[in-house]
C-alpha cells in the first residue's frame, strides 16, 4: 500500500536568464528510496539521481543544470523555453513509484516574482 | 592519463574465495563511481554492482548479492572486488570500470581479471 | 529488470558499407542507454553516451540514435578495425544491464 505523498514547489516563475530550484519531497512513508528521475515537459530525461550511484545529468543540460540541493535540481541560465512542466519520480522500495508535477513558467519581465512555496499537487 | 590496472589471472577451488584489485591513476578516485562487470566466456556482460568511493555507498545487481562485495581504499587509489563460494558458474573475465563525470556511462575499463574456478 | 535485446547475434558487412545494429528495451529507458565496442581480447570501450552523443575521440563515422525502447547504432562506412561486438548497455535503472551483444564480421 502506498502512502506517501509528494509534495513539489507547484506552479513557479522565474525570470528569464537567471535560475530556479525543482523540489520535490517524498513524505508520509517510510519507503525507501532508491532513484529519483526527473522529467522535461516532453518528457525527455533531465537527470537522475541514484541514492548509491549519485547523479547522472543528460549531456543536452550539463552546462545549465546542477544536482542539488539534495534530490532537487538548479536549472540555470533560464530560457523562454524552459517554460513548462517538470516531472521528479522517485522510485521507491517497498512502496513502488511516486510522482510529482511542478509548473515553472518563465518570464521576460525584470520583475517577476520567483515563488517557492511547497504543496501537494 | 586514466588508468585502471587490475590484479592478475587467479586459479582458484571451487567452495574458495578470492579478491581482485582495481589500481586508479590519472584522476581521484572519489570523483567518479566505480563498477565491476563479469562476463563469462563467449557470453554478454553482466553489471555485478557500482560504488561510490566518496562514501563507500554501494548498489548491486540482486543476481550478485552475497557472492561480490565491492570496497574502495581511497589511500591507495584502489578498488577492490571479493567473490565468495565460488562455483564454476563464477568462472568469467571482471572488469573494472568507472563512470564518467555526472553520466552513468562507463568511460574506462580495466584489462580485466580471468578467474578460473577449478578443482 | 530490464531485458536488452540485440536481434542480431551475428552481422556480415563489407568494407564502406553501411551497417546498423538494433536494440530493443522491455520498457521505457529515455535516452539512458550506451554503445560499446569490444574488439577480440580487448575490454570493452565506450563509443555512444546518452543515446546519441558520440564519445571523445571516437571517428564520426559512428552513430546512435533513438529514444523510449529503440535504439539503433549505425556505422556509415565500415572499416577492417571496426570488426568486434557491440554492446548496448541501459542504465535508467538498476540494475544495469547490456544486450546480448552483436559480433560484426567483415566479408
Known amino acids: 500500500m502506498m502512502t506517501g505523498t509528494i509534495e513539489t514547489t507547484g506552479n513557479i516563475s522565474a525570470k528569464k536568464g537567471g535560475s530556479v530550484i525543482l523540489q520535490c519531497h517524498l513524505s508520509s512513508t517510510m519507503a525507501q528510496v532508491t532513484q529519483v528521475n526527473w522529467e522535461q515537459h516532453d518528457h525527455s530525461l533531465l537527470a537522475i539521481r541514484n541514492a548509491e550511484l549519485g547523479w547522472h545529468i543528460y549531456p543536452a543540460f550539463k552546462d545549465r543544470v546542477a544536482p542539488g540541493p539534495g534530490l532537487g535540481l538548479t536549472l540555470q541560465s533560464l530560457t523562454m523555453n524552459d517554460t513548462g512542466e517538470y516531472f521528479c519520480t522517485y522510485h521507491t522500495y517497498p512502496d513502488g513509484t511516486y510522482r510529482g508535477r511542478i509548473f515553472l513558467e518563465v518570464l521576460e519581465s525584470s520583475v517577476a516574482e520567483h515563488s517557492a512555496r511547497f504543496q501537494i499537487p | 592519463q586514466v588508468q585502471l590496472k587490475q590484479s592478475g589471472p587467479e586459479l582458484v577451488k571451487p567452495g574458495a574465495s578470492v579478491k581482485i584489485s582495481c589500481k586508479t591513476s590519472g584522476y581521484t578516485i572519489t570523483e567518479n563511481t566505480m563498477h565491476w562487470v563479469k562476463q563469462s566466456h563467449g557470453k554478454s556482460l553482466e553489471w555485478i554492482g557500482g560504488?561510490?568511493?566518496?562514501?563507500?555507498?554501494?548498489s548491486y545487481n540482486q543476481q550478485f548479492k552475497g557472492k561480490a562485495t565491492l570496497t574502495v581504499d581511497k589511500s591507495s587509489s584502489t578498488a577492490y572486488m571479493e567473490l565468495r563460494s565460488l562455483t564454476s558458474e563464477d568462472s568469467a573475465v571482471y572488469y573494472c570500470?568507472?563512470?564518467?563525470?555526472?553520466?552513468?556511462?562507463?568511460?574506462?575499463w580495466g584489462q580485466g581479471t580471468t578467474v578460473t574456478v577449478s578443482s | 529488470d530490464i531485458q536488452m535485446t540485440q536481434s542480431h547475434k551475428f552481422m556480415s558487412t563489407s568494407v564502406g558499407d553501411r551497417v546498423s545494429i538494433t536494440c530493443k528495451a522491455s520498457?521505457?529507458?529515455?535516452?539512458?542507454l550506451a554503445w560499446y565496442q569490444q574488439k577480440p581480447g580487448q575490454s570493452p570501450k565506450l563509443l555512444i553516451y546518452?543515446?546519441?552523443y558520440r564519445y571523445t575521440g571516437v571517428p564520426d563515422r559512428f552513430t546512435g540514435s533513438g529514444s523510449g525502447t529503440d535504439f539503433t547504432f549505425t556505422i556509415s562506412s565500415v572499416q577492417a578495425e571496426d570488426l568486434a561486438v557491440y554492446y548496448c548497455?541501459?542504465?535508467?535503472?538498476?540494475?544495469?544491464?547490456f544486450g546480448g551483444g552483436t559480433k560484426l564480421e567483415i566479408k
Open positions: 546518452s543515446a546519441s
Open positions: 520498457q521505457d529507458v529515455k535516452t539512458a
Open positions: 560504488i561510490n568511493p566518496n562514501n563507500g555507498g554501494t
Open positions: 570500470t568507472r563512470s564518467s563525470y555526472y553520466r552513468y556511462d562507463l568511460d574506462y
Open positions: 548497455h541501459q542504465h535508467y535503472t538498476t540494475p544495469w544491464t
